[in-house]
């Protein structure tokens, strides 16, 4: 294991659980996670004495790291001590070193809610010349409270003299306020009201008011999948609003369909994104037949950040069909990845490019997570193409070799799927793929090289491929004809397969 | 059918006021995001304020102070409130109706209201 | 603020000709680039919107086309009553700005 510094706790009781007659009271310091062994813990105990003892370190199973206890036991008039625990551990550093300050004891209390509430903008999105901003701590047992206000991230020299505290009932309130120039607020900083309370830190953050022109909304209407549309016959569409500022107003999204009928009832999904913006989700279930038929969908998204309403519709694409070829490949075992393999499928010339891609072992389809699909690409020609890349392990291949690659398509007969499979070890030298309803034992060779399998297309030839009759000098088995694929510039590939 | 009627307009002096009205009809005004376009003579148009279904308002950076736009669903109006007028207002002003679904322009326009400013 | 410039300010076809009209925006727009036709005396009425979709009661001799920044207004075969001003409008949702619509474009008889 690499070197680890400690993190390191401070272990204390409830203050309610020690007596009040106690003459002497034990505190404690936890490091752990560190590693390599040792860690120096020593203690300030101020005015009074105390023994110390350190507890021989312990394994953390998981980790091979360590962790030790050190106790303090004091006497005297401990309650309004602060005790200090100091840990040290060369082997991070010669110099590091970890200070916890406290008490005896932990007292019950009930923290603060820490609330940034800003001057507001006028309608047209201006802002005053100065703007205030006011930090709400309220709700807390009485008790000392530091308010450091932090322009983003560095403390700000402010006047705390204002801040002013009030008790109801057996709860306190305090409010600070920062006033700002309009340039500085702007200026697009980030404004943190933090308060320390009973060894704890508290906050809250504001920027200005959300642009009143929300550049950066976008709006998206799917287009519902193959695989929902032809094999689970439950198709949905989705309307996805994004980058939109959080406000009091919520997004109205509305459906309907060109033709006037009624739609389905749609869920909705909203959700905060991690830069600050909501994500807005509408899910409409659409009737296969429908979708099929040529029905248009519209998702109408208005929000009272938005200075016009929005507008997406979706139908079912037209042009041009045409079906998908599909390509399954094993790539070679790589040197340090015995246990592992990756497959591959190439699914190419395929209009218009909604398509659906699984991978299916043991007659069970994969979860969609096990594999990484590209979106659809243009190809030279007219029609489109994906990879999708599957890891399997060798418990898999050993279980079963065979995975299926399998795609559908609006245009794939009969059913809407194309499928081929792939072996990791197709017991052949070279290993690649063969296609799922290939015999046995094909083999290919252009010109010179013999007994290179290769992905045959099943029983129908590929287009430009022509049909010859079988070699008797073929290992194969004599009623499989010869399939000759006419290629420009390069010896042709001859492979056998059903003609 | 769908009509806007735009009225208030005429002759006032620099530094005065107008308030301008647009009485829609024919459709439902509270389902319609709402902008007023001014055109000055011989000029080109040019967008001046938009007031959305929740009846939030936006202006055109020059306009913002001195324009303020409103709407009265109940009563099928809305206005325009110009304040501090100067020569250069002197334009035919427009009341128009965005397109239900939004995003997609002006569906409908009423004949406008000629503001002159002029002393 | 997406700043919309319209080219060319001034047009002279004949009846019959095909007059296409450039629009080119200062950012991309993502939806609601609209076309309208002016005459004399009138307000503007609405032909294309949403870059491409005919209006309706349009004639099929008007097209639109473009995406991202650069716009185009085609007629196809000018008609007589096609002599007016066409103005571009971009109607972006999440945008306002001084210059929604292009400075204009006055088809003139040659």
């Known amino acids: 294991a690499s070197t680890q510094s400690p993190s390191v706790f401070p272990l204390t009781r409830c203050c309610k659980n020690i007596p009040s007659n106690a003459t002497s009271v034990t505190l404690g310091c936890l490091a752990t996670g560190y590693f390599p062994e040792p860690v120096m813990v020593t203690w300030d105990t101020g005015s009074l004495n105390g023994t110390t003892m350190t507890l021989p370190a312990t394994t953390l199973t998981l980790s091979g790291h360590y962790a030790t206890i050190s106790l303090l036991t004091v006497s005297g008039a401990w309650a309004k001590q602060m005790f200090t625990c100091r840990v040290a551990h060369t082997p991070s550093s010669t110099d590091w070193v970890d200070n916890k300050t406290f008490s005896v004891c932990s007292r019950d209390f009930t923290p603060p809610t820490v609330k940034i509430l800003q001057s507001s903008c006028d309608g047209g999105g201006h802002f005053p010349p100065t703007i205030q901003l006011l930090c709400l701590v309220s709700g807390y047992t009485p008790g000392t409270i530091n308010i450091t206000w932090l322009e983003d991230g560095q403390v700000m020299d402010v006047d705390l003299s204002t801040a002013s505290t009030t008790q109801e009932g057996e709860l306190a309130s305090t409010q600070s306020e920062l006033t700002l120039s309009q340039k500085h607020w702007l200026s697009d900083r980030t404004y943190t009201c933090q308060v320390t309370y009973q060894g704890h830190t508290f906050e809250d953050s504001t920027k200005k008011c959300a642009d009143s022109n929300p550049r950066g909304v976008s709006a998206y209407l799917s287009r519902p999948s193959p695989f929902d549309l032809f094999i689970r016959k439950s198709p949905t569409i989705t309307c996805l609003v994004v980058d939109l500022a959080p406000s009091k107003g919520t997004v109205n999204l509305t459906w309907s369909r060109a033709s006037g009928k009624p739609v389905n009832h749609s869920t909705r999904k909203e959700e905060k994104q991690r830069n600050g913006t909501l994500t807005v989700t509408s899910t409409l279930p659409v009737g296969t037949r429908d979708w099929i038929e040529g029905e248009t969908y519209q998702c109408r998204v208005t929000h009272p950040h938005l200075p016009r309403a929005l507008m997406r519709s979706t139908t079912k694409t037209s042009g041009p069909r045409a079906a998908p070829e599909v390509y399954a490949f094993a790539t070679p075992e790589w040197p340090g990845s015995r246990d592992k393999r990756t497959l591959a499928c190439l699914i190419q010339n395929f209009m218009p490019e909604d398509i659906s891609v699984q991978w299916l072992h043991n007659e069970v389809q994969l979860p969609d997570a096990r594999h990484s699909t590209t979106q659809p690409r243009k190809t030279k020609g007219s029609g489109f193409f994906v990879f999708s890349r599957l890891e399997v392990t060798r418990a898999e291949w050993e279980q079963k070799d065979e995975f299926i690659c399998r795609a559908v398509h609006e245009a794939a007969s009969p059913s809407q799927t194309v499928q081929r499979a792939v072996s990791v070890n197709p017991g052949l030298a070279g290993g690649s793929a063969q296609s799922q309803r290939a015999p046995d034992r094909v083999l290919c060779h252009s010109g010179q090289q013999q007994g290179l399998p290769r992905a045959a297309g099943g029983s129908v030839p590929h287009p430009r491929c022509h049909c010859g009759a079988g070699r008797a000098d073929w290992p194969g088995p004599p009623e499989l004809d010869v399939c000759v694929e006419e290629a420009e510039g390069e010896a042709p590939w001859t492979w056998t397969g059903l003609c | 059918q769908v009509q806007l009627v735009e009225s208030g307009g005429g002759l006032v002096q620099p530094g005065g006021s107008l308030r301008l009205s647009c009485a829609a009809s024919?459709?439902?005004?509270?389902?319609?995001?709402m902008t007023w376009v001014r055109q000055a003579p011989g000029k080109g148009l040019e967008y001046v304020s938009i007031?959305?279904?929740?009846?939030?308002?936006w202006y055109a950076n020059w306009a913002s102070g001195r324009f303020t736009i409103s709407r009265d669903n109940s009563k099928n109006t809305v206005y325009l409130q110009i304040d501090s007028l100067r020569a250069e207002d002197t334009a035919t002003y427009y009341c128009?109706?965005?397109?239900?679904?939004?995003?997609?322009?002006?569906?409908?326009w009423g004949q406008g209201t000629l503001v002159t400013v002029s002393s | 603020d997406i700043q919309m410039t319209q080219s060319p300010s001034s047009v002279s076809a004949s009846v019959g000709d095909r007059v296409t009209i450039t629009c080119r925006a200062s950012?991309?727009?993502?939806?609601?680039l609209a076309w309208y036709q002016q005459k004399p005396g009138q307000p503007p009425k609405l032909l294309i919107y949403?870059?491409?979709t005919l209006a309706s009661g349009v004639p099929s001799r008007f097209s639109g086309s473009g995406s991202g920044t650069e716009y185009a207004l085609t007629i196809s075969s000018l008609q007589p009553e096609d002599f007016a001003t066409y103005y571009c409008?971009?109607?972006?949702?999440?945008?306002?700005?001084?210059?929604?619509f292009g400075g204009g474009t006055k088809v003139e008889i040659k």
């Open positions: 128009a109706r965005e397109t239900h679904h939004g995003s997609s322009g002006i569906d409908h």
């Open positions: 024919g459709f439902t005004l509270s389902n319609h995001d």
């Open positions: 007031i959305n279904t929740y009846g939030n308002h």
């Open positions: 950012q991309s727009i993502y939806s609601g």
């Open positions: 949403d870059h491409s």
């Open positions: 409008q971009h109607a972006d949702y999440a945008h306002h700005s001084d210059n929604v």
